[in-house]
Every structure is written in C-alpha cells, then in structure tokens.
C-alpha cells in the first residue's frame, strides 16, 4: 500500500481466483483514543471500533472511502483504491491501446518544435468517474523539471457502437535547451483513476523523436507565362523553432489529381518554393519535416490548381 | 578552417558534408524510429557516447560569440564515432551487407573531422578508453544504439554548419 495523495491510498493486489489479498491497517487521524467507529462509503454498518482498523483487501468491494467517527462526528477519511496485477502485469483497463507506432502504446506525444513544449494524449471509452493526473521529468535517476497542466477532455468520437474520449495534456520543460542534443529522455507518467480502480501509464521519449511540424503556411501558386508550370511558394509555420537558418526544414511537394488512383508527382526540396506542372482539377500539397533528423512529416497544406 | 587560432572553417563544405552525414546515418539505420530503444542497458550506451550539451556553445548565440568551442566539441565527437564505426562492433561478425552505408558513413566522419582540423593543426590528442569486447549477438544491439545516437549528434552538427554557412561565412 502507498499514498497517492493526502488520504488516498493505493493497494496493490495480485489478481487471480482465491487470491489472499492484502492486509491493510487504517489509522484514524485524530488525537482521540476511545469511542471511535469505522464505516465504509455511505453504509452505516459499523466495521470495527478503535483507533485502527485492520481489513483484508481482496476485491473492489473492499475498496472505497473508510471513515472513522466519534459520536456522530467525522474524524477522518481514507480512500482505498485498487491496482490490479494479473500474471505479473499491471492492468491497463482504463486506457485504449492506440497500437501506433507499436502495440501497448497508451500515451502518444508530439512536439511542434524544439522549445521543450509537447502535448500528450490518450483514449478511453469511459465517460464518468474518471480522473487523470500527469507528472513529467527529464531523466529518472536525477530528474530535471517538466511542468504539465491539467489533463482535459479534448475530443469525443463515435466508433461503431462505442463513444471514444480523447484526453490531452500540455507540458513544458522548465529549462529547455533547444539547440542541444538530448541525452536523457523525457519521462511522462499518467495516473488514471476510474471509480476505485487505479492504473498508471508511462511514456519515455526524446523531443527530437516526437517532433511533428505544423503544415507550411501561406501556400501560394504563381502561374508561369506560356506554360503549364506554376511556381509554388510557402513559408515556415509560425510555430517552428527559430532561426530557420539553424532549425531548418525540408519539404515535400505533391501534385495529386482528383482521383486517388492517379499518379502522384512528388518533389523534395530544402527551399520554400518549387516549380511543378499543374494538371486540371489537381491540387498541390506541401508538407514539412526536420531537415536533419527524420521525425514525423507535418500534415499537408493544400491548394487547388485551378 | 577551424584551427586552434580561431580562423573560420569552410562552412559551406562542412554544411554539405554534415548534411550528407545525416542522410547516411539514417540510411544506415532507417527503421530506427520504429524500434523501442529503451531496453535494459540503453542508458549506459547513450551515456557512453558524446553529446553536444547546452554549454557547448553550439546554439546560434554561442556560434556568434565564439564558434571554436562548438567546433572543437563537434570534432571530438566525430573522432569518437569514427573510432566506434571502425571498431569490431561494426567490422566483426555479423558482417555488414556489402552495400551497407556504414563504410561511407565512417569515411564521411573522418572527412568532416579533417575539414575541421587539417593536417598540422591539433586541438588535443583524442583519448578513447579500451572498448569492451563484444559478441555477435551484442554487436547488433550496439550498432543500433550507436547509429541511433549518431543520428542525433550529426543532426546538431548539421544545424551548426547550416547556420554558420548562412550567417558566419565570409
């Protein structure tokens, strides 16, 4: 058993049929010694008396809010949550496996630049009685500070018969050094509580590996005289790190016909313009990637040819 | 050229070669981003290789103030990785494929380090500890981790030379 926060405790249980459970001793936070009784949740049934209460925690029915009273007055509370371990593996019932980039990916994180700011998100099908708390650091043995905000519900989607909820959180490294080469990964830890079930999820990454620039901005076409060719130009996204002579991007320009089956013409360039042939009903798209480190491409910015 | 007295390197040449190094480092291990590299022992390997750190003067302001600190740091790292790529971690069994870019990567590391420090000029003798012997099964993982770290190292070096070529070239 360990304390998650004031008056909230997590009991770690090996979860299998007829498991013996864990013996837990609760102590009433009071100077009083006599006349103390204990109850669980809203029930008025007295579970025991005295300053301490010993219970055997085996299942969710044994978890909940234990309250000690004296003469009708509440003295203190202890909320017990359960953390299940099945076949040596902690349960992951609350969050959905996103399976990208690999199985058992519950948290996904992205950064728009090298400033030390990043966003993580996760999915669940649970709609109520759900709380999250997020902590982060750079490195684990001698952790350096990363400040995370509160997790918020960022999207709701219908997937077949189920509703899916996306939560996200923004974090910022306290003393980020955008130009340096990271040697210690960022660690992100999410505590999830659904009713009386506790679970924790972690992710470890370098900012450089989760970089995904915003799409190029101000994408424009300039027809060239007496030619089917056009000059496409664009700019670095506002959110990208500066100076651009140091934090450089490379770009992919794509000409795509109306039909998905039509052949795509692609040009790669380090410049912020390119000359391409504009076919009728086609569209021109441009995306960006860090020039020197192969992290994710941005989403496409597109304009129609006509 | 970046010589101990402090004259400028051939920024544009360094830019071109460092960008080539980035391409080679990724073609030597393209699937790197899809593998989980935080298995047991990874911290030791990443701690053992050079890193361009915050105080090394490789940020735009530091380069403007005095690029020599950063260039020396990059030079040290290039020599270090060149020695690793020339060691039996890469030359021993299992043999690399004949068309593996590791050979080109090794040569390019040496080439860039020589651009930074031509014959007759010396920063300091490059010291590298004895390498631990490795078995074939260990080499595959070590190669992966070294190339992974090298990708990050040369990315920073390439940014430095690109910025230098754009803003510090005579």
């Amino acid at each position: 058993i360990w304390e998650l926060k004031k008056d909230v405790y997590v009991v770690e249980l090996d979860w299998y049929p007829d498991a013996p459970g864990e013996m837990v001793v609760l102590t009433c936070d009071t100077p009083e010694e006599d006349g103390i009784t204990w109850t669980l949740d809203q029930s008025s049934e007295v579970l025991g008396s005295g300053k301490t209460l010993t219970i055997q925690v085996k299942e969710f029915g044994d978890a909940g809010q234990y309250t000690c009273h004296k003469g009708g007055e509440v003295l203190s509370h202890s909320l017990l949550l359960l953390h299940k371990k099945e076949d040596g593996i902690w349960s992951t019932d609350i969050l959905k496996d996103q399976k990208e980039p690999k199985n058992k990916t519950f948290l996904r994180c992205e950064a728009k630049n090298y400033s030390g700011r990043f966003t993580c998100w996760w999915l669940t099908t649970i709609s109520t009685d759900l709380t999250f708390s997020v902590k982060s650091s750079r490195g684990s043995s001698d952790p350096q500070g990363v400040t995370c905000g509160a997790a918020t519900l960022s999207a709701e989607r219908v997937r077949g018969d189920n509703k899916e909820y996306e939560y996200s959180v923004e974090c910022q490294e306290d003393s980020a050094c955008p130009a340096a080469e990271e040697s210690l990964p960022i660690e992100v830890m999410v505590d999830a509580v659904h009713k009386l079930k506790y679970e924790n999820y972690t992710s470890s990454f370098f900012i450089r590996d989760i970089i995904k620039p915003d799409p190029p901005k101000n994408l424009q076409l300039k027809p060239l005289k007496n030619s089917r060719q056009v000059e496409v130009s664009w700019e670095y996204p506002d959110t990208w790190s500066t100076p651009h002579s140091y934090f450089s991007l490379t770009f992919c320009v794509q000409v795509q016909g109306k039909s998905k089956r039509e052949k795509k013409d692609r040009v790669f360039t380090d410049k912020t313009s390119a000359t391409v042939i504009c076919r009728k009903n086609a569209s021109i798209s441009v995306r960006a990637q860090d020039r020197y480190y192969s992290s994710s491409w941005s989403e496409w910015a597109s304009v129609p040819c006509s | 050229r970046a010589v101990p007295g402090g004259s400028s390197p051939a920024w544009t040449q360094c830019q071109q070669l460092s960008q080539k190094l980035c391409t080679l480092a990724w073609s030597a291990h393209p699937l790197v981003g899809h593998m989980d590299l935080r298995e047991e022992g990874d911290e030791e390997t990443t701690n053992d290789v050079p890193h361009i750190q915050c105080g090394d003067g490789c940020d735009p302001q530091g380069l403007r103030d005095n690029s020599q600190f950063c260039l020396q740091r990059i030079h040290q790292g290039l020599i270090f990785y060149e020695k690793l790529l020339g060691s039996d971690i890469f030359t021993g069994e299992p043999s690399l494929l004949p068309d593996s870019p590791v050979g080109q990567l090794h040569a390019s590391l040496l080439g860039l380090s020589q651009l930074l420090q031509p014959e007759g000029h010396h920063w300091e003798t490059q010291q590298i500890p004895s390498l631990s012997p490795s078995q074939p099964w260990q080499r595959l993982l070590l190669r992966f981790k070294i190339l992974r770290s090298l990708q990050a190292f040369v990315a920073v070096a390439a940014r430095v030379f690109a910025h230098g070529a754009a803003t510090l070239s005579p």
């Epitope: - | 047991e40 390997t45 290789v49 890193h51 500890p129 004895s130 099964w137 260990q138």
Partner: antibody, heavy 120, light 113 residues
Framework: QVQLQESGPGLVKPSETLSLTCTVS????????VHWIRQPPGKGLEWIGV???????DYNPSLKSRVTISRDTSKNQFSLKLSSVTAADTAVYYC??????????????WGQGTLVTVSS | DIVMTQTPLSLPVTPGEPASISCKPS????????????LAWYLQKPGQSPQLLIY???TRQSGVPDRFSGSGSGTDFTLKISRVEAEDVGVYYC?????????FGQGTKLEIK
Amino acid sequence: QVQLQESGPGLVKPSETLSLTCTVSGFSLISYNVHWIRQPPGKGLEWIGVIWTGGSTDYNPSLKSRVTISRDTSKNQFSLKLSSVTAADTAVYYCARDKYGLFPGYFDYWGQGTLVTVSS
Amino acid sequence: DIVMTQTPLSLPVTPGEPASISCKPSQSLLSSGNRKNYLAWYLQKPGQSPQLLIYYASTRQSGVPDRFSGSGSGTDFTLKISRVEAEDVGVYYCLQHFNYPWTFGQGTKLEIK
C-alpha cells in the same frame, strides 16, 4: 538483492592450482561482467581478470600465463583457477561485477572475499 | 599499464575536520569524446570488502553520504571528505578503468587522531 559469494579451499599447497567459485544472484548475467580481484594480507588491491557478458576473458598480463576464468551460466557461477601457486599468491580473493557497456566499467558490488593461504 | 599514485599513504584526521586524498594516474583517464573520467573511489573498512563511493571521478554512488565528493580530470583527481566521522576510517583506493588491466592506487589509510 545483488549478491556475490566466493567459496573454495582456504589452504592450497605450493605448485598446486588454486580453484575458487563465485556464485551470484540478483542480477542478469547478460548485463554484467564478473571480475576477480585479490588483496595480499596488509597490502593493496590487484585486478586478476574479467569474464565478459559474451563469455570472452581478459587477464592481468602479470598473471596471464597462470589464470583461467570460466563460468557456468546455468548455475550462476564463475570460477577462477590460478596454477603453480606460491606463497606470494596468499591473499583474500574477491569477485566483483561491472555493468556491460561500450567501455569497461567500475565495480559496483563485491563479494565478501575469501582468504586463500598457500602453504605446505 | 596505467600506474595510479595515491597520496598521502596515511592520513590521521580529527573528527569533524576535512580530509583530502589525491590520485594521479600516469596517463589521462579523460575520454575527450564523452567527457567522462574513467576513475572510481572505494573505501575498504576494516575486515570488509571495498565499497564504491564515487564513479566517473565525481558522481556519488547512491546511499553514499554527501560529505564525500570527488573532483578532478585527466591526470589529477581528489577525494574530499568535508567532515570526517568515526565510521569513515579504513583504506581508500582509486581505480582506473580506462584501459586494461584495471589498476588501483596503493591505498590511503584514514585513521582518527
């Protein structure tokens, strides 16, 4: 928890072979090299040799012709053999471990040591 | 072989006073690439096996009191104890693991005055 335990005869006759065993627990043999170090009574520490995680060995040049280090991974045991011993080989013999990495590491855990006396 | 020269060989100290031990290898232990010094400090208490105090010249092993600190680089290293306590008595050794064979200093015997 991490443990290394040396064992073997406390008395060996001159010209014979000293044989010691180091039994380890609490760590993965894939991740740690195991070393032998000795300390003559009232003197300093001398490195004897190492068996690397991959099974290869390196020995102190001053002892190389007489030393063999081997292992039995199924039993989590490492052995030291030192042939043609003399009174100068009387010492406390320790086994210790270091984390396998690109470069040789430092010894973070040691056994409690076993005294071997060479005498007829 | 790299020769490790430790001084002093004997160090009588009054409890509460600082103590300092020097270790000078015959060649640099600094790896210029990764800026690590391949030097460790050990304390061997009477009748016990050596215990790791400091690694990479200046990183304190977990559980080691913060009165112990290591400094130096290349060919000149120092172990300092800010305020000596009775339990610090024993022999202190430096170890180089830059090249085979690993070599130790001769040891410094710290005793309470």
